[in-house]
């Protein structure tokens, strides 16, 4: 068998570091046998059999010219071997964040803090961290390690799914190549990394007979889950054309009806969504979408919801069109508290 | 011989921007992580910012999240500091650093006076 | 953040002295730690990392010890070149932190 360990990465290939001392190892003879080393293609001889160190070829102080194909004979001229020499670095820590949108998966991205220039892969796995007692700030020996599968096509991406929103996990990822291996250990919970995705179909349109007023609604994100244990709260922004400063609202539900509007002007509108509980961060923002409010007097009867929605002012602009998610809605005490004539008209 | 020259300090006044540059030679540029470091005149040193060689990832300190933003042009050996909204105690000298790793500062610039003032 | 003491903040000693400083974190670092000679006027350079390895080209009078929380630099015997405030830096993490540097001059 060959005296030479196959180190990970390609047969054939042997790996060093530049400006260190570089050993390669002649594999088809047994361990000690002297033999002479050639650069292929190159008549001249590096290294001969009584240089008393066997099956091996040493390079001092190695650099990028050294990096090539070398062949190795026995004593009596047969082939011991081609080795092929990488040279490069040894893995460095990776640089690791983890994020989620929603309270019950969250994924880890990964870069490498340094290119080792050399092949490299990917390990990572995950345990969940356990407090003892409630009073306690001791931990209980980790349960795991689980490998956190990583995505196909070599995105630098894990994902843990059916994560415990009042967990912690570490976050193992360890960068491998053939010179070694270097671990980042990253502690996480889902309430300090959730960020909700921006809140989806924003809609914002006109108020028949009220040239201050624009009702903007939307629906909770798709990535949200369907039935879910915990609500998002939601922050909205509006603006005039051309002016540059944003008033913000925190809405009530999954509508809100602008009451300030500037007459005859359009206005952007977009919306975030948070944690109902703060916990994690807003989401981004929502594309904007922009309405105009209309023009002419208030009405002498109050139109039902489905008139307005039917007949508004403006065409509906929808940035992100996502079907209505009725089950995702609150039960309506929660959407609003507002007078249902100041506001028009309530969600159906 | 490994260098990074750093560029575009200068004097500004509080709520104003300027752009810091780094140019780096004598080494493959694409591979290391780089970050600025600042020292505040007759101060001690603050890490301000670091980025992966892809920029994939980048990195910031409090006092600077969300007014500062760090990136790189690997295709021209470039580190950038975009730097806005600036207030008095941003005034400090800014170093450019390249790696190893993260968070390890192996190589210096000289750095680049930056004095916001009004 | 990982907050990072240094002791004393400054230090009179005598040519051919040992001296000796202290650094320590707020939070096990593991070996992930640095140590930097600033002279005045000039941008810090590396002289010990991860704790113990000495920087290529640095001289071996600078040395490096420690784990976990509690760290040492030592300069065996002080030359009048060591003249610098000397800075302890953790990597642990994703946001190093510089300790606040103790200044060494010759008595």
């Known amino acids: 068998s060959s005296p030479c360990p196959q180190a990970w990465g390609p047969p054939g290939v042997q790996y060093g570091q530049p400006g260190r001392s570089v050993k390669l190892c002649c594999p088809g003879v047994t361990a000690g046998d002297p033999v002479s080393w050639f650069r292929d293609g190159e008549p001249k001889l590096l290294q001969g059999p009584d240089s008393g160190l066997g099956h091996e070829l040493v390079l001092a102080q190695a650099d990028s010219t050294d990096e090539g194909t070398y062949i190795c004979q026995t004593l009596d001229g047969a082939l011991g071997g081609t080795v092929t020499l990488q040279l490069g670095y040894p893995p460095a820590r990776p640089v690791v964040s983890c994020q989620a949108a929603d309270y019950e998966n969250f994924s880890c991205t990964w870069s490498p803090s340094q290119i080792s220039g050399l092949p490299t892969r990917y390990l990572t796995s995950y345990r969940k961290k356990t407090v003892l007692g409630a009073d306690s700030q001791r931990r209980s020996p980790s349960t795991g390690p689980w490998p956190c599968p990583q995505d196909p096509l070599g995105a630098a991406r894990c994902v843990v799914h059916g994560a415990e929103f009042w967990s912690q996990y570490r976050i193992n990822v360890t960068e491998v190549n053939p010179l070694g291996a270097s671990t980042r250990l990253l502690d996480v919970s889902l309430q300090s990394i959730l960020r909700p995705d921006p809140p989806q179909g924003l809609r914002v349109e006109s108020v028949p007979g009220y040239p201050r007023r624009l009702r903007a609604s939307w629906t909770y994100p798709a990535s949200w889950p369907c039935q879910p244990h915990f609500l998002l709260k939601f922050r909205l922004q509006y603006r005039p054309a051309q002016h540059p400063a944003w008033s913000t609202v925190e809405p009530a539900g999954l509508e809100e009806v602008i009451t300030d509007a500037v007459a005859g002007l359009p206005h952007a509108v977009r919306v975030s969504a948070r944690d109902f509980l703060d916990a994690g961060t807003w989401s981004t923002w929502s594309p904007e979408a922009w309405g105009t409010p209309s023009t002419g007097t208030i009405p002498k009867e109050i139109p039902a919801w489905g008139q307005l929605h039917t007949q508004p002012e403006v065409e509906p602009q929808v940035d992100s069109p996502a079907p209505p998610r009725p089950s995702l809605q609150p039960h309506p005490r929660l959407l609003d508290h507002r007078d249902s004539v100041e506001q028009v008209a309530v969600l159906a | 011989e490994v260098q990074l020259l750093e560029s575009g300090g200068g004097l500004v006044q509080p709520g104003g921007s300027l752009r810091l540059s780094c140019a780096a030679s004598g080494f493959t540029f694409s591979w290391y992580s780089m970050t600025w470091v600042r020292q505040a005149p007759g101060k001690g040193l603050e890490w301000v910012s670091s980025i992966v060689p892809s920029g994939g990832h980048t990195q910031y300190a409090d006092s600077v999240k969300g007014r500062f933003t760090i990136s790189r042009d690997n295709s021209k050996n470039t580190l950038y500091l975009q730097m806005n909204s600036l207030r008095a105690e941003d005034t400090a000298v800014y170093y450019c650093?390249?790696?190893?790793?993260?968070?390890?500062?192996?190589?210096w610039g000289r750095g680049t006076l930056v004095t916001v003032s009004s | 953040d990982i907050q990072m003491t240094q002791s004393p903040s400054s230090l009179s000693a005598s040519v051919g002295d040992r001296v000796t400083i202290t650094c320590q974190a707020s939070q096990d670092i593991n070996n992930y730690l640095n140590w930097y000679q600033q002279k005045p006027g000039k941008a810090p350079k590396l002289l010990i990392y991860d704790a113990s390895n000495l920087q290529t080209g640095v001289p071996s009078r600078f040395s490096g010890s420690g784990s976990g929380t509690d760290f040492t630099f030592t300069i065996s015997s002080l030359q009048p070149e060591d003249i610098a405030t000397y800075y302890c830096q953790q990597y642990d993490n994703l946001s190093p932190t510089f300790g606040p540097g103790t200044k060494v001059d010759i008595k």
């Open positions: 650093a390249k790696g190893p790793g993260w968070g390890q500062f192996a190589v």
